[in-house]
């Protein structure tokens, strides 16, 4: 019995109703390995999911997220709502990043601006909700003899942007 079933290829199952012959997987099911006694149910890409790859008798369907959502988890097991840049998703929906933080993507959380002074540098471009600060040369590098066409913005920590 074991040997008979091991001969059943992917896309079939070993059917005990028929003296262990290999039967094709029923509609909407698949077996990706040989010797299976029951085929697995195809994943359905419904609701916020859309089909990226159709199910076949030997491989499962693959899902993506519809517009306005992005995949989370292994094999896109969940779809999470997109937010705008400068926002993060909370239990109450998309919220603007707090002052001193930014998010340059449609997903993920707001992160603190870089603290330029920790690297001994100054703020070259102020941070916003959507963008991190840009750190410039350290104040010591900004001697009168230094070749700089335009003076940098005054150093403000952690970087100021009117919001």
């Amino acid at each position: 019995l074991q040997d008979l079933c091991s001969n059943c290829p992917a896309g079939t199952f070993c059917d005990n109703n028929r003296s262990q012959i290999c039967s094709p997987c029923p509609p909407n099911s698949f077996s990706s390995a040989g010797g299976q006694r029951t085929c697995d149910i195809c994943r359905q890409c419904k609701g916020v999911f859309k089909t990226r790859k159709e199910c076949s008798s030997t491989s499962n369907a693959e899902c993506d997220c519809i517009s306005g959502y992005h995949c989370l988890g292994a094999e896109c097991s969940m779809c999470e709502q997109d937010c705008k840049q400068g926002q993060e998703l909370t239990k109450k929906g998309c919220k603007d990043c707090c002052f001193g933080t930014f998010n340059d993507q449609k997903r993920g959380i707001c992160r603190p601006w870089t603290n330029c002074s920790l690297d001994g540098k100054s703020v070259l471009v102020n941070g916003t909700k959507e963008r991190d600060v840009v750190c410039g040369p350290s104040p010591a590098d900004l001697s009168p003899g230094a070749s700089s066409a335009t003076p940098p913005a005054p150093a403000r920590e952690p970087g100021h942007s009117p919001q």
């Epitope: 074991q2 079933c5 199952f13 059917d15 005990n16 109703n17 039967s23 029923p26 509609p27 909407n28 990706s32 390995a33 010797g35 299976q36 006694r37 029951t38 697995d40 149910i41 359905q44 499962n60």
Partner: antibody, heavy 118, light 108 residues
Framework: QVQLQQSEAELVRPGASVKISCKAF????????INWVKQRPGQGLDWIGY????????TFNRKFKDKATLTVHKSSSTAYMELSGLTSDDSAVYYC???????????WGRGTVVTVSS | EIVMTQSPATLSVSPGERATLSCRAS??????LAWYQQKPGQAPRLLIY???TRATGIPARFSGSGSGTDFTLTISSLQSEDFAVYYC??????????FGQGTKVEIK
């Protein structure tokens, strides 16, 4: 002897979780899906979902997707179902059952009684 | 999801008589239907699968028929051990696999 042996009855508090087990004897564990079925006292049968021990693939009844987590431990031929956020509605007998061929259940465990009470 | 409706809810039959149980699906399930027997305090037991095939060890007095939406389980001559609750279950196409609410066969 081919059988599915389930864990003993559980009495749990509302809001808690419980993990019940189903150990397979007499057949190759990875060859057959393990399904879980709920039966409330004096009521009918409700299919929760299955796990394929060969590849850990799971399929759920949508209404149990956030309630039940299905896992297997291949080396001990044991399937587990964890139920979380328990309420009185989760008080029931839970059966594990095997499939072979199409998705009918040819072998059943004796059931685990879960009682949710404060 | 496919809804399975069994009738009657209770069937009173004398030992030795014939019992006919009905199961109707809300949409076609082809021949993908099983019947189970459950006695008090016990797990269900598979009787019939694929609408009409008897499971291993099931006596010949149990027979199943039907396809599409209408199915019948017949017990040709009821024995004392046959008094129980009987459930139908569809396993067609997509899950969830669904059961009927059961028919209780009791002694008349």
């Amino acid at each position: 002897q081919v059988q599915l042996q389930q864990s003993e009855a559980e009495l749990v508090r509302p809001g808690a979780s419980v993990k019940i087990s189903c150990k397979a004897f007499g057949y190759t564990f990875t060859n057959h899906h393990i399904n879980w079925v709920k039966q409330r006292p004096g009521q009918g049968l409700d299919w929760i979902g299955y796990i394929n021990p060969y590849n850990d693939y799971t399929t759920f009844n949508r209404k149990f997707k956030d309630k039940a987590t299905l896992t297997v431990h291949k080396s001990s031929s044991t399937a587990y179902m964890e139920l979380s956020g328990l309420t009185s509605d989760d008080s029931a007998v839970y059966y594990c059952a095997r499939t072979w061929g199409h998705w009918y259940f040819d072998l059943w465990g004796r059931g685990t009684v879960v009682t949710v009470s404060s | 999801e496919i809804v399975m409706t069994q009738s009657p809810a209770t069937l009173s039959v004398s030992p030795g008589e014939r019992a006919t149980l009905s199961c109707r699906a809300s949409q076609s399930v082809s021949s993908n239907l099983a019947w189970y027997q459950q006695k008090p305090g016990q797990a269900p037991r598979l009787l019939i699968y694929d609408s009409s095939t008897r499971a291993t060890g099931i006596p010949a007095r149990f027979s199943g028929s039907g396809s599409g939406t209408d199915f019948t389980l017949t017990i040709s001559s009821l024995q004392s051990e046959d008094f129980a609750v009987y459930y139908c279950q569809q396993y067609n196409n997509w899950p969830p696999w669904t059961f009927g609410q059961g028919t209780k066969v009791e002694i008349k």
